[in-house]
């Protein structure tokens, strides 16, 4: 098909982060077209010669795909017609980080938008009471992080207190030699208090809370990706 008249269509991307070894999504939406056969989606990566992915005439066109993305990409084919050009990236690698461009061609015109994609490892921490210790101790563990994060303890009762003197954090390299297991131990814990173990790197921030009373232990954890509107 051809484009008659110069029109620019709106393309929107969202910065996101990928967890290495897992699948990731590079988000991109555009003004939809009536005919699927008139839509071309091209994903490019800065510094890469071949295409990350191309979808045209209703199907994948991978003849120009770069070797580093071979067999790892897919668009949501059934959602292209409604303006979803998001890319699914399988088995995210550390080297997938960088600037991507979502380039769209339709019968209405062309448009593109860039996207910053960060890669690393992040996981939920779990906080437990360490009954093996000689004093009341909490142990915070998270299985996969990269780059190396910072770990900070906080408490509801002693707000603003610095626990660095009564805590010890270690990082153990996992078998794939990239990600690390995070273990942090907090000593001299008091009953009837809520403690938070906060793990953070430039990609994600995760918090594990534990409420310790004489009668029960309550746990809660959550993870938030940084610099991402997702």
């Amino acid at each position: 098909f051809g484009i008659s008249g110069r029109h620019s269509i709106t393309v929107t991307t969202v910065a996101s982060a990928g967890n290495i070894g897992e699948d990731g999504i590079l988000s991109c939406t555009f003004e939809p077209d009536i005919k699927l056969s008139d839509i071309v989606i091209q994903w490019l990566k800065e510094g890469v010669l071949g295409l990350v992915h191309e979808f045209k005439e209703g199907k994948d066109e991978l003849s120009e795909q770069d070797e580093m993305f071979r067999g790892r990409t897919a668009v949501f084919a059934d959602q292209v017609i409604v303006g979803n050009a998001s890319l699914r990236l399988k088995n995210v690698q550390l080297t997938d980080a960088g600037t991507y461009k979502c380039y769209i061609i339709t019968s209405k015109g062309k448009g593109n938008a860039n996207l910053e994609y960060k890669t690393g490892a992040f996981s939920m921490p779990e906080v437990n009471v360490d009954y093996n210790a000689s004093s009341e101790t909490l142990r915070c563990e998270a299985p996969r992080w990269f780059p190396q994060p910072t770990v900070v303890w906080a408490s509801q009762v002693d707000q603003g207190a610095n626990f660095s003197e009564v805590s010890n954090t270690s990082f153990e390299l996992n078998s794939e030699n990239v990600t690390m297991k995070v273990v942090s131990v907090l000593y001299n814990v008091t009953i009837n208090n809520t403690y938070s173990c906060m793990i953070e790197n430039d990609i994600a921030k995760a918090t594990g809370d534990i409420k310790v009373t004489e009668s029960e232990i309550k746990r809660r954890s959550h993870l938030q990706l940084l610099n991402s509107k997702a």
């Epitope: 490019l44 800065e46 890469v48 010669l49 770069d66 061609i105």
Partner: antibody, heavy 117, light 105 residues
Framework: EVQLVESGGGVVQPGRSLRLSCAAS????????MNWVRQAPGKGLEWVSA????????YYADSVKGRFTISRDNSKNTLYLQMNSLRAEDTAVYYC??????????WGQGTTVTVSS | SYELTQPPSVSVAPGKTARITCGGN??????VHWYQQKPGQAPVLVVY???DRPSGIPERFSGSNSGNTATLTISRVEAGDEADYYC????????FGTGTKLTVL
């Protein structure tokens, strides 16, 4: 300041070899794909070769395929063009240029290669 | 292989508008870039992605692209605009147009 500086040009006999270098500064070299482009005297621009940021992927124009090799040393921020079996028609000013998506946004000042007996 | 055709020369009076065309099969679906090259100097990118201008390039330079023709438009032409102009697309390599010599009368 973003800068590309080519070197290594000169006069060489047909069939001989020459290696061009391009020193990059002012940007993260390893993140950018790079190109060599040439211009014969009084002629237009002709793309020669391209290399990905990692150096893993290379493309060549048909006119130089099998004779020229593009490479890079990211630790030295330097791009190279090894030119073997040179011909008279390879006489040109050779530019290195930074690839930016589908175009080239930064060019060096060029180095002159003359192939003559 | 893909080919881009430009007129060899375009002449224009100072203060007027110059239009340089670049023809290619269904070029409207490709991203077109334009370079200015003055004698003895390296090319300079003046328009990228059909119609966007790099920082430092005057607003007088604009581009459009549809169908089989991309166009570089230089409004209020100045003597300093006299140069060779090349269009370029990517097609498994950089493809350059044949080049157009802009003469300011």
């Amino acid at each position: 300041e973003v800068q590309l500086v080519e070197s290594g040009g000169g006069v060489v006999q047909p069939g001989r070899s020459l290696r061009l270098s391009c020193a990059a500064s002012g940007f993260t070299f390893s993140n950018k794909a790079m190109n060599w482009v040439r211009q014969a005297p009084g002629k237009g621009l002709e793309w020669v070769s391209a290399i990905s940021g990692s150096g893993a992927t290379t493309y060549y124009a048909d006119s130089v395929k099998g004779r020229f090799t593009i490479s890079r040393d990211n630790s030295k921020n330097t791009l190279y063009l090894q030119m073997n079996s040179l011909r008279a028609e390879d006489t040109a000013v050779y530019y290195c240029a930074r690839k930016r998506w589908y175009g080239m946004d930064v060019w060096g000042q060029g180095t002159t290669v003359t192939v003559s007996s | 292989s893909y080919e881009l055709t430009q007129p060899p020369s375009v002449s224009v009076a100072p203060g007027k508008t110059a239009r340089i065309t670049c023809g290619g099969n269904n070029i409207g679906v490709k991203a077109v870039h334009w370079y200015q090259q003055k004698p003895g100097q390296a090319p300079v990118l003046v328009v990228y992605d059909d119609s966007d201008r790099p920082s430092g390039i005057p607003e007088r330079f604009s581009g459009s692209n549809s169908g089989n023709t991309a166009t570089l438009t230089i409004s209020r032409v100045e003597a300093g605009d006299e140069a060779d102009y090349y269009c370029q697309v990517w097609d498994r390599g950089m493809i350059f147009g044949t080049g157009t010599k802009l003469t300011v009368l």
